[in-house]
C-alpha cells in the first residue's frame, strides 16, 4: 500500500517528498512535479523501489507545485498519491560593511545565508568619474575580501550581489573614501666624507615602489643629480661629490604613480683630506723607510720622490697604491742624506706635498774570516763585523768535493766566533759567512779549511835482520802519541813476550839478543792519554847463526902447517884463530884474520909438536860457534 505522501520545502529552490510503502514490494516509483498553474511542462522522475524519500531541486522560488507519485509492482501501477506545496522566498543579502580602509586598499565584509549563493559579484567604482569599474567575483562561501590597488584619498562606491545559477540578488552598496598616502619619516645624513655621504631614512615597510633622491649643490643652478633606488632600501651611499661643498639632498617615495611629499636635508662635504706625519727612518745602509698618515680609502695613489740632498738632478720617483701607508725605498747609497717628498692623488687632485730628510746608515761590513784550532773533526771560525747591525750570521760549510750535505748555521749577530764540529777528518771545506739584518744581507765572504787527518800509525817496517835481532821502524803523525808500545813474541809463544815502551817521538827500535832462526811477531801500538791504538803487526824470522866449518890442516912443516876452512859468504867481519900445544907448555897464539880469508900458513911453531887449533868467526861483534882441529908439526 502506498500512502502518507508529504511534501516540504527545501530552501527556496527545492522540495522534499516523503511516503510510506510496504517493504520490498515495489520495483520503482514514478514521481511527477508540475507548477500548479501548469506554466511549464511537468518533470518526471523514476526512483528505485527501495526509496521512501527524495529531494527535488532546481525549482522556482515562491512557486506552488503539484507533486504526484505511484509505485510499480510487476508491471502494475498503484493508485496515484498527490500533494501540493510551495517553494520558499529567494534569500536576500544581509548587510555590507567596509571593515578596514587604507590609502591603497580596503577590506569588505558582508552577511548572507549559508549555502545560498554560488558566488558574489563585487563592483568597485570611483565615484564621480566615468572610469570603468573594477569587477571581481568571489566564491559563495566567503563573507570577506580585500580590495587592493586603489587610489589614495579617493571616493569609491562598492556594490555586491549574490548569484546562483539562474538568480542574482538585489545589490547592496557602500561608499568609502581611501586614506591619504602615508608620509615618509626622517631623512638623515649619517656619514660625510670629502667626496661622499650616506643617507638614511625611515618609512613604513613595503609602502613604496621606489625612492627618488635628488642631490644638488646648494646655490647652484647646475642640473641636479637624480638617483632612483628600490623601495626596499633605507640607506644609500652618494658618491662622487666635491670636497668642501654644500649640498641639498631631497628624497621622496613613489607608489603606483603617487609621490610623497619630499624630505630634504642640507650637508657640507668634508674638505679634501691632507697627508700627515711623514716620517723617514733608515733601513740599514742602503734604504729608507717612509711612513705617513692619510684618510682611509681616499687616495688613488701616492707619488714619492727621493733625491740625494746634494744632487738635485738625480731624483727617483715611485708611484704607490693608495692603500699603502708605508714603503721601503731600497737601493740607496750608504751614509748619504736624502730628501723625500710625497703627495696623494684623488681623482686627479693632488694633495699638498709633504717632505722630510734622512740619511742612510754606514754600510755594515764583515771581514777577516779566519780559521783556527783545526782538529780532525772541527775548527774554529772568527771574523770582524760592524757592531750593533746584524741580527744573525749565516755560516755555510761546504766540502770542496761536494760529497757531503751542506751544513748551515744561523748564529746571533752578537757573535764573532763559532766552533764548527762533527766534521769528517782529512776533508777540504769552504766556509761562507754572511751577515743578516732587517733588509740587509751582506756580500758573502769565504775561507777554506781542511780538517786534520786522524792521527796515523802506519808502515811498520822490519830491517837489518840478523841471527840475533832486527830493527823495527814505523811512521806516525807528529805529536799524536804520548808513547809507543812495541811487543815482541816468538811465533811459538814459548817465551814470555818482550815489551818496550818508547816515547811518542821515537819511530825506531833496534832489537838484539833474540834467538837465531826462529819466527817472531812484532806489534806496535800508540797511546794517547792512555788510549791504545789497534796495533800494527809484522812477522819476521831471525837469520840462522852463521857457520865456520871444515877446518883442515895440510902441508905440515917442522915449524908450522897450512890451515883452511869454509864460512858463509858476507856474514863475518873477521875470523879468530887460537893455536896452543896440547900439553900447554907454551903461550897460546891468537891470530885475527880479515873476513875474506879462508886459508892461513902458520909458522914459528916447535917441531914434532901436537897443537890444538880453534877457529870462530865474528859477525857484528858476536862470535860464531867454534870449530876445532888437531895438527902436528913435522920432524926436523
Amino acid at each position: 500500500e502506498l500512502e502518507n505522501l508529504t511534501v516540504t520545502e527545501v530552501g527556496w529552490d527545492g522540495l522534499r517528498l516523503n511516503w510510506t510503502a510496504a517493504d520490498q514490494a515495489y520495483e520503482h516509483f514514478i514521481i511527477q512535479v508540475q507548477e500548479a498553474n501548469k506554466v511549464e511542462a511537468a518533470r518526471n522522475l523514476t526512483v528505485p523501489g527501495s526509496l521512501r524519500a527524495v529531494d527535488i531541486p532546481g525549482l522556482k522560488a515562491a512557486t506552488p507545485y503539484t507533486v504526484s507519485i505511484y509505485g510499480v509492482i510487476q508491471g502494475y501501477r498503484t493508485p496515484v498519491l498527490s500533494a501540493e506545496a510551495s517553494t520558499g522566498e529567494t534569500p536576500n543579502l544581509g548587510e555590507v560593511v567596509v571593515a578596514e580602509v587604507g590609502w591603497d586598499a580596503l577590506k569588505l565584509n558582508w552577511t548572507a545565508p549559508e549555502g545560498a549563493y554560488e558566488y558574489f559579484f563585487i563592483q568597485v567604482q570611483e565615484a564621480d568619474t566615468v572610469e570603468a569599474a573594477q569587477n571581481l567575483t568571489v566564491p559563495g562561501g566567503l563573507r570577506s575580501t580585500d580590495l587592493p590597488g586603489l587610489k589614495a584619498a579617493t571616493h569609491y562606491t562598492i556594490t555586491i550581489r549574490g548569484v546562483t545559477q539562474d538568480f542574482s540578488t538585489t545589490p547592496l552598496s557602500v561608499e568609502v573614501l581611501t586614506e591619504e598616502v602615508p608620509d615618509m619619516g626622517n631623512l638623515t645624513v649619517t656619514e660625510v666624507s670629502w667626496d661622499a655621504l650616506r643617507l638614511n631614512w625611515t618609512t613604513p615597510d613595503g609602502t613604496y615602489d621606489q625612492f627618488t633622491i635628488q642631490v644638488q649643490e646648494a646655490d647652484q643652478v647646475e642640473e641636479a643629480h637624480n638617483l632612483t633606488v628600490p623601495g626596499s632600501l633605507r640607506s644609500m651611499e652618494i658618491p662622487g661629490l666635491r670636497a668642501g661643498t654644500p649640498y641639498t639632498v631631497t628624497l621622496h617615495g613613489e607608489v603606483r604613480g603617487h609621490s610623497t611629499r619630499p624630505l630634504a636635508v642640507e650637508v657640507v662635504t668634508e674638505d679634501l683630506p691632507q697627508l700627515g706625519d711623514l716620517a723617514v727612518s733608515e733601513v740599514g745602509w742602503d734604504g729608507l723607510r717612509l711612513n705617513w698618515t692619510a684618510a682611509d680609502n681616499a687616495y688613488e695613489h701616492f707619488v714619492i720622490q727621493v733625491q740625494e740632498v746634494n744632487k738635485v738632478e738625480a731624483a727617483q720617483n715611485l708611484t704607490l697604491p693608495g692603500s699603502l701607508r708605508a714603503v721601503d725605498i731600497p737601493g740607496l747609497e750608504a751614509a748619504t742624506p736624502y730628501r723625500v717628498s710625497i703627495y696623494g692623488v684623488i681623482r686627479g687632485y693632488r694633495t699638498p706635498v709633504l717632505s722630510a730628510e734622512a740619511s742612510t746608515a754606514k754600510e755594515p761590513e764583515i771581514g777577516n774570516l779566519n780559521v783556527s784550532d783545526i782538529t780532525p773533526e772541527s775548527f774554529n771560525l772568527s771574523w770582524m763585523a760592524t757592531d750593533g747591525i746584524f741580527e744573525t750570521f749565516t755560516i755555510e760549510i761546504i766540502d770542496s768535493n761536494r760529497l757531503l750535505e751542506t751544513v748551515e748555521y744561523n748564529i746571533s749577530g752578537a757573535e764573532r766566533t763559532a766552533h764548527i764540529s762533527g766534521l769528517p777528518p782529512s776533508t777540504d771545506f769552504i766556509v761562507y759567512l754572511s751577515g743578516l739584518a732587517p733588509s740587509i744581507r751582506t756580500k758573502t765572504i769565504s775561507a777554506t779549511a781542511t780538517t786534520e787527518a786522524l792521527p796515523l800509525l802506519e808502515n811498520l817496517t822490519i830491517s837489518d835482520i840478523n841471527p840475533y835481532g832486527f830493527t823495527v821502524s814505523w811512521m806516525a803523525s807528529e805529536n799524536a802519541f804520548d808513547s809507543f808500545l812495541v811487543t815482541v813474541v816468538d811465533s811459538g809463544k814459548l817465551l814470555d813476550p818482550q815489551e818496550f815502551t818508547l816515547s811518542g817521538t821515537q819511530r825506531k827500535l833496534e832489537l838484539r839478543g833474540l834467538i837465531t832462526g826462529i819466527g817472531y811477531e812484532v806489534m806496535v801500538s800508540g797511546f794517547t792519554q792512555g788510549h791504545q791504538t789497534k796495533p800494527l803487526r809484522a812477522e819476521i824470522v831471525t837469520e840462522a847463526e852463521p857457520e865456520v866449518d871444515n877446518l883442515l890442516v895440510s902441508d905440515a912443516t917442522p915449524d908450522g902447517f897450512r890451515l883452511s876452512w869454509t864460512a858463509d859468504e858476507g856474514v863475518f867481519d873477521n875470523f879468530v884463530l887460537k893455536i896452543r900445544d896440547t900439553k900447554k907448555q907454551s903461550e897460546p897464539l891468537e891470530i885475527t884474520l880479515l873476513a875474506p880469508e879462508r886459508t892461513r900458513d902458520i909458522t914459528g911453531l916447535r917441531e914434532a909438536t901436537e897443537y890444538e887449533i880453534e877457529l870462530y868467526g865474528i859477525s857484528k861483534g858476536r862470535r860464531s860457534q867454534t870449530v876445532s882441529a888437531i895438527a902436528t908439526t913435522a920432524m926436523g
Epitope: 784550532d373 782538529t375 780532525p376 773533526e377 772541527s378 786534520e452 786522524l454 792521527p455 796515523l456 800509525l457 803523525s477 805529536n479 799524536a480 802519541f481 804520548d482 808513547s483 808500545l485 815502551t501 797511546f527 794517547t528 792519554q529 792512555g530 788510549h531 791504545q532 791504538t533 789497534k534
Partner: antibody, heavy 118, light 107 residues
C-alpha cells in the same frame, strides 16, 4: 787503596770563578797522568782537561779552552782545576780521574757539584 | 758526540747483550768502556783490545771491527743494569772523547 777526593764545588754566578782540588793517595801521584771529566745533570760524561805526569803538558776540551786551567802540585799530591768566566752550561758534577801510561782513566773520585746560576 | 751509542738497550736476565759504539777514531784506537750506576762515579770495565781491570767479571768482554767497538756481557746479571759509556781518543787535540752513553736494562 787508590783514593781521589774532589773539593771546591758550589754555587757561583755566571761569569764567576771557582777552583776545584783533587787530593790523591794510594798510588804514585807523580807517575800518573791526571784529568777532569764532568757530567751535567741527567746527561753523559764529557772530558774536560788532562795533564801529564810532571805538569808540562796540558790538554783541554774546546768548550773550556781559554777559561779553565789544569795544574798539579806533585809535592802535595793534588790536582787543580781553575774555572773562570763560568757559564750556565758548565753546571755539572766534576770528577777527578787518574790514568797510568798505558790505560785510560782507571780510578775516579766521587765528584763535586758545580752549579752556575744567577 | 764523535762517538755514537744507542741510547737504550735491554736484555733478559742471564742472556747475552752487545752494546756498540761507532766513530771514525775507532778505526785507529781501541775503545774503553765505563759502567756508571746512579749516583756513583764511573768504573772502567774494558780497555785496550779486550783487557779487564782486576775485579771486573769475565762476563764482560770487548771487541772491535772497523769503526765500531762492542762491549759484550755474556750472561747479564741484575747488577749489570747501569749506564755504559764508550771512550776513546781522537788524536792529540781531542785526546779523550766519550760516547753519549747507553742505558742497559736487565729484565
Amino acid at each position: 787503596e787508590v783514593q781521589l777526593l774532589e773539593s771546591g764545588g758550589g754555587l757561583v754566578q755566571p761569569g764567576g770563578s771557582l777552583r776545584l782540588s783533587c787530593a790523591a793517595s794510594g798510588f804514585t801521584f807523580s807517575g800518573s797522568r791526571m784529568g777532569w771529566v764532568r757530567q751535567a745533570p741527567g746527561k753523559g760524561l764529557e772530558w774536560v782537561s788532562a795533564i801529564n805526569e810532571e805538569g808540562g803538558q796540558t790538554y783541554y776540551a774546546d768548550s773550556v779552552k781559554g777559561r779553565f786551567t789544569i795544574s798539579r802540585d806533585n809535592s802535595k799530591n793534588t790536582l787543580y782545576l781553575q774555572m773562570n768566566s763560568l757559564r750556565a752550561e758548565d753546571t755539572a758534577v766534576y770528577y777527578c780521574a787518574k790514568h797510568p801510561p798505558h790505560r785510560p782513566f782507571d780510578y775516579w773520585g766521587q765528584g763535586t757539584l758545580v752549579t752556575v746560576s744567577s | 758526540s764523535e762517538l755514537t751509542q744507542d741510547p737504550a738497550v735491554s736484555v733478559a736476565l742471564g742472556q747475552t747483550v752487545r752494546i756498540t759504539c761507532q766513530g771514525d777514531s775507532l778505526r785507529l784506537y781501541y775503545a774503553s768502556w765505563y759502567q756508571q750506576k746512579p749516583g756513583q762515579a764511573p768504573v772502567l770495565v774494558i780497555y785496550g783490545k779486550s783487557s779487564r781491570p782486576s775485579g771486573i767479571p769475565d762476563r764482560f768482554s770487548g771487541s772491535s771491527s772497523g769503526n765500531t767497538a762492542s762491549l759484550t756481557i755474556t750472561g747479564a746479571q741484575a747488577e749489570d743494569e747501569a749506564d755504559y759509556y764508550c771512550n776513546s781518543s781522537h788524536g792529540p787535540r781531542r785526546p779523550v772523547v766519550f760516547g753519549g752513553g747507553t742505558k742497559l736494562t736487565v729484565l
